[in-house]
Interface confidence: medium
């Protein structure tokens, strides 16, 4: 922010009324009036260029320092070119000297040169040459100097002429303040600029109404530089919940809007399925039947639990069931839908039912499913199963009701056996198989069917109670198609997949490959 100037002395604004002291009296400096831009202006002028040894002083009135520590002196003046005078005026100068003296009282007309300290020699950037003078072009020079630190009650300035043709049109003395400032929702008080160039006065800011330092943030601070400019802002204030930044203030959220936290963000419109909020709201309450999950942002619409899965099918495949369903028609306004599958089995004979989670196997964990299908295996044959698929979302836990659909299936077959080749020779194949233990008690025998590949006219069948068989009297180096099927009291179980196994060729008869 630009420095604020507090003027202590302004000659140009005084309209010739200040009555400064000239020394020697009646010679040298003289108060004159002129016309510039059709306006009368006053100036202190001296032009004793033809006489040598000039020592003409002009002293200001006593200036009360007040709270100033460093003063700035702005001079506007014109200096005439020494060559514009006939003969060049050999004793003519083109500079003058600026002095100051501090004092605790006004000495009045008692002028003593020895009390004054030189600030600088003031030289013009542009001198007024003959043609400018004739054409009334005033070549105005502006020079600024500063003095500090000042310690006494007041001070004088003095101008020493040593033989120049100079006119002082403006003498302005001021000090600088860092102005009252509102920045980052913090108010910084008007602060007097320090007197030493390297130093920066640290000033604490106070948060405006309804603004606070954010958690973990730094308190607002600024630095007031010598030139009255605020520098190096540190920290900030932010509008508290329910308020937003409007220019340099925090304004309550309008009805129908809310702000949840201390932040830079503006108030947001209440989302869908919320009740209209009052002024200054930090949140918007949900409509009846709608909810907000703990992790939901306040800007998210209120939501409700989903409806049941839209369509559920159970397709039996031996001792397996594939469950498929489609998403709920009403998602409740959320995308975090998951599904849970539960299983119940019933014995047809007794009609007794119970949970079957521990006895069946799911293709993936049955709770928190995101896909819309799952395969259930290790089902017992000749058992009735009921599967329940529940749809849940982030707000389902906030209500007691559940959204589910059920499907029932009867298992009439055992699961197809899993077949392995255990060994082979030129004339035999050793085959084993397995089925899930819960189903084994229902199996009476296993039927092994085999035939040469490519021979569709004849096949052989072997029955056994065990889980393996050796098929011999086979032709060497020949591929056989082998299938295993469980036989139960109720009939045939599901057949295994048809496997191709090859006997060894006579050359390789010395080894038994597993």
């Amino acid at each position: 922010a630009q420095g604020k100037e507090v003027v202590l002395l302004d000659f140009a604004a005084a309209g010739g009324e200040l009555g400064w002291l000239t020394h020697p009296y009646g010679k040298g400096w003289d108060l004159m009036q002129n016309i510039m831009n059709d306006m009368p202006i006053y100036m202190y002028s001296v032009c004793n260029v033809m006489s040598g040894d000039q020592d003409n002083w002009l002293r200001t009135n006593w200036v009360y320092r007040g709270e100033a520590e460093r003063i700035f002196i702005e001079l506007k003046f014109t200096v005439r070119d020494c060559n514009s005078f006939p003969g060049g005026a050999s004793s003519c100068k083109e500079t003058f000297n600026l002095y100051y003296a501090e004092s605790d009282l006004d000495y009045g007309t008692n002028f003593q040169k020895r009390l004054f300290t030189k600030i600088d020699t003031i030289a013009p950037d542009e001198i007024t040459v003959s043609s400018d003078f004739e054409a009334r072009h005033v070549k105005l020079n502006v020079e600024e100097r500063s003095v500090g630190p000042l310690t006494r009650k007041g001070f004088y300035l003095a101008f020493q002429d040593i033989g120049a043709c100079v006119a002082l049109l403006s003498v302005r003395v001021y000090y600088k303040k860092c102005p009252e400032l509102l920045q980052s929702l913090a108010r910084f008080p008007e602060t007097i600029a320090g007197s030493d160039a390297p130093s920066l006065a640290t000033v604490a800011g106070t948060c405006v109404d309804h603004a606070v330092v954010p958690p973990g943030g730094e308190e607002p601070r600024m630095h007031c530089a010598v030139d009255g400019e605020w520098l190096v802002p540190i920290g900030q204030c932010l509008c508290q919940a329910g308020y937003e930044k409007v220019e340099d203030a925090c304004q309550a959220c309008s009805p129908g809007f809310f702000k949840f936290e201390v932040s830079e963000s503006p108030c947001l419109e209440c989302p869908e399925h919320t009740l209209p909020s009052p002024e200054g709201a930090t949140s918007c309450e949900c409509e009846e039947g709608f909810f907000r999950a703990p992790q939901d942002p306040m800007s998210m619409p209120c939501t409700r639990p989903p409806s049941a899965p839209h369509y559920l099918t159970a397709v039996g495949m031996g001792a397996k069931v594939e469950l498929r369903w489609t998403p709920p028609q009403d998602s409740g306004g959320r995308e975090d839908i998951v599904y849970s599958v539960t299983c119940e089995q019933c014995w047809p004979e007794s009609g007794e039912c119970g949970p079957c989670e521990s006895s069946v196997r799911y293709s993936e964990p049955p709770h928190g499913l995101t896909r819309t299908s799952v395969t259930v295996s290790d089902l017992e044959p000749h058992m009735n199963y009921t599967f329940t698929v529940e749809a849940r979302n982030g707000v389902s836990g906030l209500v007691t009701s559940r959204s589910f659909r059920t499907a029932s299936v009867s298992i009439n077959q055992t699961e197809p056996p899993k077949v392995r080749l255990e060994g082979r020779s030129t004339t035999s194949l050793s085959v084993s198989w397995s089925i899930p233990p819960p189903q084994q008690s229902r199996v009476w025998k296993y039927e092994v069917t085999y035939r040469k590949k490519g021979d569709s006219n004849s096949y052989n069948v072997r029955r056994t109670e065990g889980f393996s068989v050796t098929l011999d009297d086979l032709a060497p180096d020949t591929t056989y198609l082998v299938q295993v099927q469980a036989l139960t009291q109720e009939g045939q179980g599901a057949g295994s997949k048809v496997h191709e196994f090859q006997t060894l060729s006579p050359e390789g008869s010395g080894s038994l490959a597993v």
């Epitope: 009036q33 002028s45 043609s131 003078f133 043709c165 006119a167």
Partner: antibody, heavy 128, light 107 residues
Framework: EVQLLESGGGLVQPGGSLRLSCAAS????????MAWVRQAPGKGLEWVSR????????HYADSVKGRFTISRDNSKNTLYLQMNSLRAEDTAVYYC?????????????????????WGQGTLVTVSS | DIQMTQSPSSLSASVGDRVTITCRAS??????LAWYQQKPGKAPKLLIY???NLHTGVPSRFSGSGSGTEFSLTISGLQPDDFATYYC?????????FGQGTKVEIK
């Protein structure tokens, strides 16, 4: 020695025109502001017009504005006054006058000038 | 325009007398004032500029003073050559204006 010599005066009818000249010598003409000042018979002095050292700016008294034109030719060291639409009240001795700021020991010139050097004058009579 | 009023309009004096002519401006002109002397049938001559500065070659018996609106020309020890009409002129604004003149005659 500074010399200013006016010419071109005479008798002219109202509404007529006349051109006055002022030949300068003895000084650097192009450094001087030049002016015309007139004096009606038995009356006081009245400033008429001025022209800057390089030919501008020019200023006129309200009584002659729009009718008189001041000009100069620095190569000929001559000042002119073209007078049109002459009236009886323009009857006067017309003096050419000059001012050199170099002799003015002041830091800022007044907006106008005084006159250091004068010619002997030329009489202009406007009568029917 | 600024009006310049001289007084008296004429005066009679003897050789050796001290004569003062005054000139009043209708508004402040600081020290932007000149004095001229004119003899019958002759061109005016510059005496004083900037209220109190003597023009080159002008006898020291002539002096000027004043600032603002009140000015005066003083001849201390009137000489026979000084009987003439004296005019003041302001040059504070572009329309340079003369006073109506003061005629100094032999008593």
């Amino acid at each position: 020695e500074v010399q200013l010599l006016e010419s071109g005066g005479g008798l002219v009818q109202p509404g007529g025109s006349l051109r006055l000249s002022c030949a300068a010598s003895g000084f650097t003409f192009s450094h001087y502001m030049m002016a015309w000042v007139r004096q009606a018979p038995g009356k006081g002095l009245e400033w008429v017009s001025r022209i800057g050292p390089s030919g501008g700016p020019t200023h006129y008294a309200d009584s002659v504005k729009g009718r008189f034109t001041i000009s100069r030719d620095n190569s000929k060291n001559t000042l002119y006054l073209q007078m049109n639409s002459l009236r009886a009240e323009d009857t006067a001795v017309y003096y050419c006058a000059g001012y050199d700021s170099g002799y003015d020991y002041v830091a800022v010139a007044g907006p106008a000038e005084y006159f250091q050097h004068w010619g002997q004058g030329t009489l202009v009579t406007v009568s029917s | 325009d600024i009006q310049m009023t001289q007084s008296p309009s004429s005066l009679s004096a003897s050789v050796g007398d001290r004569v003062t002519i005054t000139c009043r401006a209708s508004q402040s002109i600081s020290t932007w004032l000149a004095w001229y002397q004119q003899k019958p049938g002759k061109a005016p001559k510059l005496l004083i500029y900037k209220a109190s500065n003597l023009h080159t070659g002008v006898p020291s018996r002539f002096s000027g003073s004043g600032s603002g609106t009140e000015f005066s020309l003083t001849i201390s020890g009137l000489q026979p050559d000084d009987f003439a009409t004296y005019y003041c002129q302001q040059y504070n604004v572009y329309s340079r204006t003369f006073g109506q003149g003061t005629k100094v005659e032999i008593k």
